[in-house]
Every structure is written in C-alpha cells, then in structure tokens.
C-alpha cells in the first residue's frame, strides 16, 4: 500500500515544515488516493484488455457514476465555491458503494483497494469540515446501495472486469476535477 499522507519522501526532505493547512491536507489526501487508483488500474490493465477499449465503447454501460458538469459550479465558467464543494462531497458519497464493490476485485492489490476506500472516507470528513452548507449534501440511500451492490456482483466475469475498469477511470477523473476546483477555493 502507498505511504499514508504526511509520510512521503518529500516530507522527509523538509523536516522543518509547518503543520499542514486544511487545503494542503485535502490536496495531499486526493493525491494519495490517486496513487492508489493508479496501482489498482495497473493490476486491472494487466489482467484484461479493458484499458485499450475506447471511451465510446465503454460509455454504453448502465452505471450511474458521478461526473462533473458545468452546472455543478466547479468549472471556471460559473464557478461557485459552495455549489462545487457540495457536488464534490455528494459525488464522493455516491462513489462509496462502487469502492465497496472493488473490495473483492483484486488479488495482489487487495490492501490497496482497502486503502483507497478508507482514504476516501477520510477525504469526505476533511471536506465536510470545509463545507458551510451540509444540509445541501444528499446521502445515498443504504437500501438502494445494497441492491446495486448485489446487482453488480451478480454480473458475469467480463461485465465485472468492465465495471471495475469504469469505476477506477471515472473515480480518477472525478478526483482530478475535484483537485482542480479545490485549488481555486
């Protein structure tokens, strides 16, 4: 598993550093999760040829994975800090069921999959502290999530590989869009 945030080599090189600010902590947490996703994608790509499939071919799936759109207030045009923050937190909460699905999908990177899941929970907590309007954040329904998880796990092998690839790719993109937006806040 990757080194937890706050313990990487760059920190060792600069021992007299001030304690991390809230923004730095969030930035670092996202980068840590992205490292984990990168390792998981490596295993997925080695196992199947999904990574060579075009975006268009993969788009025809019935997964409702969170995605940033202009209306979410995270893009430069119409940027809105509070709306965007709500979108980021809501999106991460929606991804949690998919991260749960990933838990039994890896052999050599089982630990890594757990690290991504746990780190995402921590990231959500960091962001919730930053948000002013917590009432606007909708938490996914546990019953709906449970039935979605059952449905995903009942798919055939090829579809499960496809689903794993799509989750990792979409989660990576969502985190990158979040990272970009958070640096403007």
């Amino acid at each position: 598993a990757p080194v937890p945030p706050g313990e990487d080599s760059k920190d060792v090189a600069a021992p007299h550093r001030q304690p991390l600010t809230s923004s730095e902590r969030i930035d670092k947490q996202i980068r840590y999760i992205l490292d984990g996703i990168s390792a998981l994608r490596k295993e997925t790509c080695n196992k199947s040829n999904m990574c060579e499939s075009s975006k268009e071919a993969l788009a025809e799936n019935n997964l409702n994975l969170p995605k940033m759109a202009e209306k979410d207030g995270c893009f430069q045009s119409g940027f809105n800090e509070e709306t965007c923050l709500v979108k980021i937190i809501t999106g991460l909460l929606e991804f949690e069921v998919y991260l749960e699905y990933l838990q039994n999908r890896f052999e050599s990177s089982e630990e890594q999959a757990r690290a991504v899941q746990m780190s995402t929970k921590v990231l959500i907590q960091f962001l919730q502290k930053k948000a002013k309007n917590l009432d606007a954040i909708t938490t996914p329904d546990p019953t709906t999530n449970a039935s979605l998880l059952t449905k995903l796990q009942a798919q055939n092998q090829w579809l499960q590989d496809m689903t794993t690839h799509l989750i990792l790719r979409s989660f990576k993109e969502f985190l990158q869009s979040s990272l970009r937006a958070l640096r403007q806040m």
Partner: antibody, heavy 119, light 104 residues
C-alpha cells in the same frame, strides 16, 4: 510520438483578431489529466502563459488577458484554437502551444511546439 | 494571482561550477513547481517537475528542491551545454512563469 505544431498568420494589423491553431498527435485530449496550454514570448523577454484547455473542456485564462482570449478544442481534428482580439504591437511574440499530462495536474509542460512568430 | 520571482536574474559561471538558482512564490504552492531550460530560438525544455522530480531524459547533474514558497534548481557541475535561460513555473493555480535566470 508526441508532437505539437502551431499555425497562424505571421503578420496581424493592430485591432485585428489573431487566430492560432495547435495541431497535435501522439495523445488524446479526452484522456483525464491531459491539458493543452498556449504560452507566448516577446523577443528577448520572459515566457507568459496565456490560456489552457482541459480534457473535459474546462478552460483557464491569464487574468490580465482574459477579456481578449478564447480557447477551444476540436478533439476529432486533434486541434486547439486560440483567438486573441484587439491585437496591438506589444503582442508581437513567439506563440507556443504545449501539453501537460499527469495525475495531479502539476501543469508541467513536457512537450512543446516549435513556436510561431506573430508580428 | 500567484507571482513568481527568480534570483539572480543573470549569472556568470564557468564549466565545472556548482550553480544555484532560486525561485519564490508569492504564496504557498506546495510542490507544484516546475523548471525549464531555454536556449535562444528554441522552445523551452522541461527539466524538473513537482519541485524535485527530474524529467525523463534530463541530465542527472540537475536537481530541484523546495516546498511552499521557496525553491531551488542546482546544477552540480556546469557543462558547456548548460548555458541557457532557466525559468520556474508554478502549477498550483493554473500557470505562472518566473522572469527567468540567464546563465552565461
């Protein structure tokens, strides 16, 4: 391999609009983490970043030039277009397009075009 | 806006010298700092990214360090090919270049 090439007029009259095209190959501007930037350099002066466009069509502009710049992409043609309105003699420079691609959006420009001189 | 400053603006050195160029950011940019080398009439070349990672293909005599607001580029033993202008660039909130350091 990755290549980028700028094209556009070498000469522009004051008040006119400059349109520059960056044609690239070896990468896709739909891959998450991929960005294309425009940078300029007046003769004998420093580099100045102008604008960038992301894989998901989000855009950023240099605040001091924002009102004059528009950046767009055509992924099917592998092109990024920059337009700059109300050109002035002080806009004489070599205009470069460059790409950045990494997970954390460090905006490290790892591949550059050769540049095009606009007077 | 994040403003980048570089020192010195120009520098005379000899082959074999150890050269240090400093770059400062007007606010904390974490490790979102890149270094470029540019020769007359050519496009810049990426040397170091994320403050301390040497770009693939860049000579190992180049190294970068720093965090937050202060960064350095070091050339451990100057070679004839290293006489050029060096720019730092922040990548925390889009991009800003430093004014450059001319090494002659």
């Amino acid at each position: 391999q990755v290549t980028l090439k700028e094209s556009g007029p070498a000469l522009v009259k004051p008040t006119q609009t400059l349109t520059l095209t960056c044609t690239f190959s070896g990468f896709s501007l739909t891959t998450s983490g991929m960005c294309v930037s425009w940078i300029r350099q007046p003769p004998g002066k420093a580099l100045e970043w102008l604008a960038l466009i992301y894989w998901d069509d989000d855009k950023r502009y240099n605040p001091s030039l924002r009102s004059r710049l528009t950046i767009t992409k055509d992924t099917s043609k592998n092109q990024v277009v920059l337009t700059m309105t109300n050109m002035d003699p002080v806009d004489t420079a070599t205009y470069y397009c460059a790409r950045s691609y990494d997970d954390y959006l460090y905006y490290a420009l790892d591949y550059w075009g050769q540049g095009t001189l606009v007077t | 806006d994040i403003v980048m400053t570089q020192s010195p603006s120009s520098l005379s050195a000899s082959v074999g010298d150890r050269v240090t160029i400093t770059c400062r950011a007007s606010r904390n940019i974490n490790t979102y700092l890149n270094w470029y080398q540019q020769k007359p009439g050519k496009a810049p070349k990426l040397l170091v990214h994320s403050a301390s990672t040497l770009q693939s293909g860049a000579p190992s005599r180049f190294s970068g360090s720093g965090y937050g607001t202060e960064f350095t580029l070091i050339i451990s033993s100057l070679q004839p090919d290293d006489f050029a202008t060096y720019y730092c660039q922040q990548g925390y909130n889009t991009l800003t270049f430093g004014p450059g350091t001319k090494l002659e």
